[in-house]
């Protein structure tokens, strides 16, 4: 399987909310002995590779923000902790999973990574990640709403 990032760049005004999204693609083993662990974290372009460094998102670690389930079951973080930090991660039946960040500040700018771990018991873990950039802007040059740039081309879309 692979992880796709529909948008590689999100440009948002301060105070706006944004939902960063990843999508699980390809054949997903729905067997009883396969489970998935999905999470989010901040990173950098990488000492070893992009997303190899794991930093907290608003002081919450990848452990705090994880989703867990088998196959394509829906899941959502029920953590009061995440919601207190203006964060919520969720997953649907179609392989999409996301993190919503509320009331953005300039400090939220940076590289964000989604991580999917396919756990094949008796074999090994298979890790795949996706990366996307968030730019939070303020002042007269800031957009009125979030503008997202698709990964495949530089055509932008405005999210209202």
């Amino acid at each position: 399987f692979k992880v796709a990032t529909p948008y590689s760049l999100y440009v948002c005004p301060e105070g706006q909310n944004v939902t960063l999204t990843c999508r699980l693609l390809g054949p997903v083993d729905k067997g009883h002995d396969v489970t998935f662990y999905k999470t989010w974290y901040r990173s950098s372009r990488g000492e070893v590779q992009t997303c190899s460094e794991r930093r907290p998102i608003r002081q919450l670690t990848f452990q705090d923000l994880h989703l867990h389930h088998g196959g394509h079951q829906a899941a959502q973080t029920s953590h009061d902790l995440a919601q207190r930090h203006g964060l919520e991660s969720a997953s649907d039946h179609h392989g999409n999973f996301s993190i919503t960040m509320r009331n953005l500040t300039l400090l939220d700018s940076g590289l964000y990574c989604c991580l999917v771990v396919e756990i094949r018991h008796h074999h090994s873990e298979h890790r795949v990640h996706g990366a996307m950039e968030l730019q939070v802007q303020t002042g007269k040059d800031a957009p009125s709403n979030c503008v997202v740039y698709p990964s495949s081309s530089q055509d932008s879309e405005q999210i209202t």
């Epitope: 452990q63 756990i119 018991h121």
Partner: antibody, heavy 117, light 107 residues
Framework: QVQLQESGPGLVKPSETLSLTCTVS????????WSWIRQPPGKGLEWIGY???????NYNPSLKSRVTISVDTSKSQFSLKLSSVTAADTAVYYC???????????WGQGTMVIVSS | EIVLTQSPATLSLSPGERATLSCRAS??????LAWYQQKPGQAPRLLIY???NRATGIPARFSGSGSGTDFTLTISSLEPEDFAVYYC?????????FGGGTKVEIK
């Protein structure tokens, strides 16, 4: 704050079955691997196996024929059974939480098990 | 199974000195390697995961590096509480395996 506590007999006779339980407190047993690791006196660490919260297990091939790990989510406990023990199984036995794509981040304090007649 | 070889077996240093510990894998483990500290009579404590990510609450004097088969744990300036045994552990394949340990002792 999640804490782990091992319990069980400290002395087991050769050829018998070693049975230990690990109680998880202060957090959920969901979404992690729950492992057993042992350390013979003065030696290094050996991973015995894990049970995932879903009930799936994975054992070290060197011990697989003798090991059973089970979980009781209602009690937030997981257990180790090691059959046909010998003196070579004398060790400190640790239970630990293992995070997918990470490492053993929380350990019990360990319990010494001596195999002797 | 993947064999991890740690060197040196013992490192004799004084407080304030820099400690460099090595872990070599019998085959590539990518960057899926962790480091633990263990003091006498205590359980191991996670220091580093994925070669260089510090675990929660670990001081900045501990740093990890490397990928593939060769890894290093560096303690930039030894504090009295850092004298202990250090283990590396791989997680690219099961069974999970540990190195034999490096003892950092006071010179």
């Amino acid at each position: 704050q999640v804490q782990l506590q091992e319990s069980g007999p400290g002395l087991v006779k050769p050829s018998e079955t070693l049975s230990l339980t690990c109680t998880v407190s202060g957090g959920s047993i969901s979404s992690y691997y729950w492992s057993w690791i042992r350390q013979p006196p003065g030696k290094g660490l050996e991973w015995i196996g894990y049970i995932y919260y879903s009930g799936s297990t994975n054992y070290n091939p060197s011990l697989k024929s003798r090991v059973t790990i089970s979980v009781d989510t209602s009690k937030s406990q997981f257990s180790l059974k090691l059959s046909s023990v010998t003196a070579a199984d004398t060790a400190v036995y640790y239970c630990a939480r293992d995070i997918p794509a990470s490492a053993f981040d929380i350990w019990g304090q360990g319990t010494m098990v001596i195999v002797s007649s | 199974e993947i064999v991890l070889t740690q060197s040196p077996a013992t490192l004799s240093l004084s407080p304030g000195e820099r400690a460099t510990l090595s872990c070599r894998a019998s085959q590539s483990v990518s960057y899926y390697l962790a480091w633990y500290q263990q003091k006498p009579g205590q359980a191991p404590r996670l220091l580093i995961y994925d070669a260089f990510n510090r675990a929660t609450g670990i001081p900045a004097r501990f740093s990890g590096s490397g990928s593939g088969t060769d890894f290093t744990l560096t303690i930039s300036s030894l504090e009295p509480e850092d004298f202990a045994v250090y283990y590396c552990q791989q997680r690219i394949n099961w069974p999970l395996t540990f190195g034999g340990g490096t003892k950092v002792e006071i010179k």
